[in-house]
């Protein structure tokens, strides 16, 4: 992470993407340590904007405003040089979010993908954004940036992610920026969880009292495996959300979760997946599909006693 020979390394914590009102620490790492340093903001003229102030270890900026967005550099203290200061550091871009209406983020073909596949994340808005930025939660690298394409009063950008592997799973958000203010970003899109399946052994899925039930009869779907999964996810074909439950160790050394579906009203095809707490967005292979059939008088919906997860939240730990 060190800079070149006489070049400090400027970094931001916790992130270079900071919401309005948030705080960020700028750290200038120079010659195996944090020495005194000066900060510059590249606003046309390359002059210290901090009134010649000298900082030690880090400079905390905040509550940040749109004016804080931009490119920063630092110079480390070099007492025995001609100028007393090092060469300028790497440029560090600080992006301030929350300045325009949020864009929308969609996954094509969908947010549940097999390892090795490619997904297109489309960020779009009716605000005429010049650039779109895609950011994965928990990643300190700068967001990916694309120029927005404008068609029929909508600006959009397609981010291609893949081939998918565990490190690319997670919660994504996108932002937009308007011309002349490239680092003053919009509010974030609603979060979108990208889940990668097919990494571990498939669990088995069964129905109690059985896969064919009378209308009104209570049905429970059990997902189990010899693998020590922490969480099981149950999905129903044609439904956008999944249900999840904590796995419980059983006396026969399997790990199981029982999903009560309540009184049967109509059937459907179900699948379940297992995942580990450490990697909540990386799932097992799908169980074999289980077709639940209801005999009698079907109605249009099946109540959900287990609370469905929202479009996002899959990649959060289940506490």
């Amino acid at each position: 992470l060190m800079g070149g020979q006489d070049k400090p390394f400027l970094s931001a914590r916790p992130s270079t993407v900071v919401p309005r009102g948030g705080h960020v620490a700028l750290q200038c790492h120079y010659r195996r340590g944090f020495n005194n340093f000066m900060l510059y903001k590249e606003d046309r003229s390359h002059v210290p904007i901090f009134h010649g102030r000298i900082f030690q270890e880090s400079f905390i900026m905040g509550p940040v405003t749109p004016a804080h967005a931009g490119t920063y550099r630092c110079r480390g203290s070099r007492p025995h040089s001609l100028t007393g200061w090092s060469a300028p550091s790497n440029p560090l871009v600080i992006m301030v979010t929350g300045n325009h209406r949020k864009p929308s983020l969609l996954a094509h073909p969908g947010p549940l993908l097999k390892s090795g596949e490619t997904v297109i994340l489309q960020c779009w808005s009716d605000v005429m954004f010049e650039h779109f930025f895609l950011h994965r939660e928990g990643i300190s690298e700068d967001p990916s940036r694309l120029v927005g394409q404008i068609h029929d009063g909508v600006s959009k950008a397609n981010f291609s992610i893949g081939p998918l592997m565990p490190v690319l799973a997670g919660t994504y958000r996108c932002y937009g920026s308007v011309p002349h203010s490239p680092y003053q970003l919009s509010a974030p899109s609603d979060p979108l969880d990208i889940v990668i399946t097919g990494l571990y052994e498939k669990p088995s899925l069964s129905a109690q009292p059985g896969p064919t039930v009378q209308a009104g009869e209570n049905v429970t779907l059990s997902c189990s495996s010899w693998s020590s999964y922490d969480i099981y996810h149950l999905s129903r074909e044609g439904e956008a959300h999944e249900r999840r439950l904590r796995a419980v160790p059983k006396v026969n050394r399997t790990f199981q979760a029982d999903f009560p579906l309540g009184p049967a009203t109509h059937g459907g095809t179900y699948r379940c997946f297992g995942s580990f707490r450490a990697l909540p967005c990386v799932w097992s292979n799908s169980s074999d599909p289980l077709l639940v059939s209801v005999t009698g008088n079907p109605s249009s919906s099946w109540p959900s006693p287990t609370e469905p997860s929202s479009k996002s939240g899959i990649c959060r730990h289940l506490h």
Epitope: S15, V18, P19, R20, A25, P63, T97, G98, E137
Partner: antibody
């Protein structure tokens, strides 16, 4: 020691305006942002907005954007909040609070609160 | 805007008990979280900042933990003066929203 002294209780009629104050002492007024928080009777706390007394920069919770005006007088180390077009729903205790320093700062000092009653 | 979900909304306990209050953020707030105690008719008082740091003068029976989206305030060995309402608040971008509060009552 740090103190935030707020102005006294106010009773106003619907449609009127009110300007409450928060006088800071015991620290450099321009080095910290001043925030305002409201608490309706029997309810929780709501962040209204803040002012940076050094620059005059203000930011408001969207919910209160057309309701509040935040100002500061650096010569007297006093922050002000004006509430306009008062309605009975604005009846609440209003607190000023100083945002501390550091990377993860909290509201480290609070005023004692100004009670506003809006009634016809 | 970031939502803060605090639970439980009320809690009955006895002197000497250990109680836990949780606060869940709708997104990662990077430990930008404070806990406050408020007694009837008084201004809130800071207990914990940066999720885990105890404010000056706060008794060591109070402790904060958590990271990411999930945070906890724990009070060990409740004292009579601890019966009050507790609020969490995030600082990761405006608006700095508060949790709904937890009223801690004597059993």
């Amino acid at each position: 020691q740090v103190q935030l002294q707020q102005s006294g209780a106010e009773v106003k009629k619907p449609g009127a305006s009110v300007k409450m104050s928060c006088k800071a002492s015991g620290y450099t007024f321009t080095s910290y942002t001043m925030h305002w928080v409201r608490q309706a009777p029997g309810q929780g706390l709501e962040w209204i907005g803040y002012i940076n007394p050094s620059s005059g920069y203000t930011e408001n919770n969207r919910k209160f954007k057309d309701k509040t005006t935040l100002t500061a007088d650096t010569s007297t180390s006093t922050a002000y909040m004006e509430l306009s077009s008062l309605r009975s729903e604005d009846t609440a205790v209003y607190y000023c609070a100083r945002l501390g320093k550091g990377l993860l700062p909290p509201f480290d000092y609070w005023g004692q609160g100004t009670t506003l009653t809006v009634s016809s | 805007d970031i939502q803060m979900t605090q639970s439980p909304s009320s809690l009955s306990a006895s002197v000497g008990d250990r109680v836990t209050i949780t606060c869940r953020a709708s997104e990662n707030i990077y430990s930008n979280l404070a806990w406050y105690q408020q007694k009837q008719g008084k201004a809130p008082q800071l207990l914990v900042y940066a999720a885990t740091n105890l404010a000056d003068g706060v008794p060591s029976r109070f402790s904060g933990s958590g990271s990411g989206t999930q945070y906890t305030l724990t009070i060990n060995s409740l004292q009579p003066e601890d019966f009050a309402t507790y609020y969490c608040q995030h600082f990761w971008g405006t608006p700095y929203t508060f949790g709904g509060g937890t009223k801690l009552e004597i059993k």
